[in-house]
């Protein structure tokens, strides 16, 4: 059978369906979870919903064969199989591999290092989120786009503040964290701060291992 991939955000309502029309006047139609767990079967004009973790949150549309699942969770990750028994005795199968992802959490920007190096300022920031498989992109006044969790840059002496935004994303959501840095490089009370929640549309966090009490948190 054909295999289709679907990625959705947890908590959403999902429609599992095939892109082609069902065989005409089919005899029976069954949806399976992980190949052998029956969810629902249609036959003789009625849908039979079986005891499973889906009972009460699925609905079958016999016309299209679509299976509606409400409030999907990560535990619903699986290959779903739609099996159709045709009037001539043949069976046809379609498979949908469903990946349910949580929205990415808000990133924490951590100052790993900042020091004077030959009158320039060396800055190392890391963008941290708990145990997720995500993509990272840093934006700001950078020589090139950086696509990992750590940003290392050397700043020439400057008067104005520099801001760096870390964007974490998976295929269903993305969140930003922005860190602004003002000279001098290692002054005890240097102004390093995060753009506020209102500016970014979400609470951001900053953690610095050194001089933690000097940093302004929002």
């Amino acid at each position: 059978g054909r295999l289709v991939h679907m990625t959705v955000v947890s908590g959403s309502n999902v429609t599992l369906n095939i892109s082609e029309s069902l065989p005409e006047n089919y005899k029976q139609l069954t949806w399976f979870y992980t190949f052998d767990q029956k969810i629902v079967e249609w036959d003789s004009g009625k849908s039979k919903y079986f005891e499973s973790k889906f009972k009460g949150r699925v609905r079958l549309d016999p016309q299209s064969g679509a299976l509606y699942i409400s409030k999907v969770q990560k535990e619903d990750n699986s290959t779903y199989v739609m099996r159709v028994l045709k009037k001539d005795g043949y069976e046809q199968e379609w498979k949908i591999k469903l990946q349910v992802l949580d929205p990415v959490p808000k990133p924490v920007i951590k100052i790993e290092k900042r020091e004077d190096v030959d009158d320039n300022c060396y800055l190392k920031l890391s963008c941290v989120i708990p145990g997720e498989s995500v993509n990272y992109t840093w934006y700001g006044e950078l020589p090139k786009e950086i696509q990992n969790s750590v940003l290392e840059t050397t700043l020439k002496p400057h008067k104005h503040s520099r801001c760096y935004t870390c964007q974490v994303s998976n295929s269903v959501s993305s969140k930003n964290g922005t860190f602004c840095f003002s000279p001098p490089c290692t002054a005890a009370r240097s102004e390093q701060k995060l753009i506020s929640e209102e500016d970014l549309g979400g609470e951001q966090k900053l953690i610095s291992e050194e001089d933690l009490h000097h940093h302004h948190h929002h």
Epitope: K27, Q28, E51, K87, D88, E91
Partner: antibody
Framework: QVQLVQSGAEVKKPGAAVKVSCKAS????????ISWVRQAPGQGLEWMGW????????NNAQKFQGRVTMTTDTSSSTAYMELRSLGSDDTAVYYC??????????????WGQGTLVTVSS | DIQMTQSPSSVSASVGDRVTITCRAS??????LAWSQQKPGKAPKALIY???SLQSGVPSRFSGSGSGTDFTLTISSLQPEDFATYYC?????????FGQGTKLEIK
């Protein structure tokens, strides 16, 4: 894994009745139908009837009409086949077999190990 | 009732041989046909359904073909464990009926 475990061998007198059980495990019992098939010594297979474990709907071969009763107990995931008015030609191994669908498709994917019923005076 | 007739009723073959068993229905059953294998003292085992679909776990040396009234079970290269009796069965209509069986013996 899917298993159908049947009750043990029985010896019955002519005119008596026998009730064979088939306990299912490893799958959602109500999501499949059960057929009963028998095999007389040295003979071929003979379909007796079918029951839906979902709603108890049945269909029996005309030959056994009025003499066979098929039931299920969903709480114990067990199917039963009772055959009454036994004669010597009912001596056979009786098998339960799982249908691929909750309504009968006639396609069996798993079989019980069989129950030998001997009818002898 | 639909009658199912298998041929031959028995066949002798050697390991590695290609074997074909045929089954004929007394009326058109489209593709509503299954094949099963039975060894002495054991329950039947499902091999093929819908004329040509292999049951899960069945080796690919087994194949089925046909539709309407004429059907074939083929074992491409016989293995020692394949010596058994094979039954065809129609699933087109109640009552389901079986062929009389084909006994596959070692030559």
């Amino acid at each position: 894994q899917v298993q159908l475990v049947q009750s043990g061998a029985e010896v019955k007198k002519p005119g008596a009745a026998v009730k064979v059980s088939c306990k299912a495990s490893g799958y959602t019992f109500t999501a499949y139908g059960i057929s009963w098939v028998r095999q007389a010594p040295g003979q071929g297979l003979e379909w007796m009837g079918w029951i839906s474990a979902y709603d108890g709907d049945t269909n029996n071969a005309q030959k056994f009409q009025g003499r066979v009763t098929m039931t299920t107990d969903t709480s114990s995931s067990t199917a039963y086949m009772e055959l009454r008015s036994l004669g010597s030609d009912d001596t056979a191994v009786y098998y339960c077999a799982r249908d691929r669908y909750s309504s009968s498709s006639g396609y069996f994917d798993y079989w019980g190990q069989g129950t030998l019923v001997t009818v002898s005076s | 009732d639909i009658q199912m007739t298998q041929s031959p009723s028995s066949v002798s073959a050697s390991v590695g041989d290609r074997v074909t068993i045929t089954c004929r229905a007394s009326q058109d059953i489209s593709s509503w046909l299954a094949w099963s294998q039975q060894k002495p003292g054991k329950a039947p085992k499902a091999l093929i359904y819908a004329a040509s679909s292999l049951q899960s776990g069945v080796p690919s040396r087994f194949s089925g073909s046909g539709s309407g009234t004429d059907f074939t079970l083929t074992i491409s290269s016989l293995q020692p464990e394949d010596f058994a009796t094979y039954y065809c069965q129609q699933a087109n209509s109640f009552p389901y009926t079986f062929g009389q069986g084909t006994k596959l013996e070692i030559k």
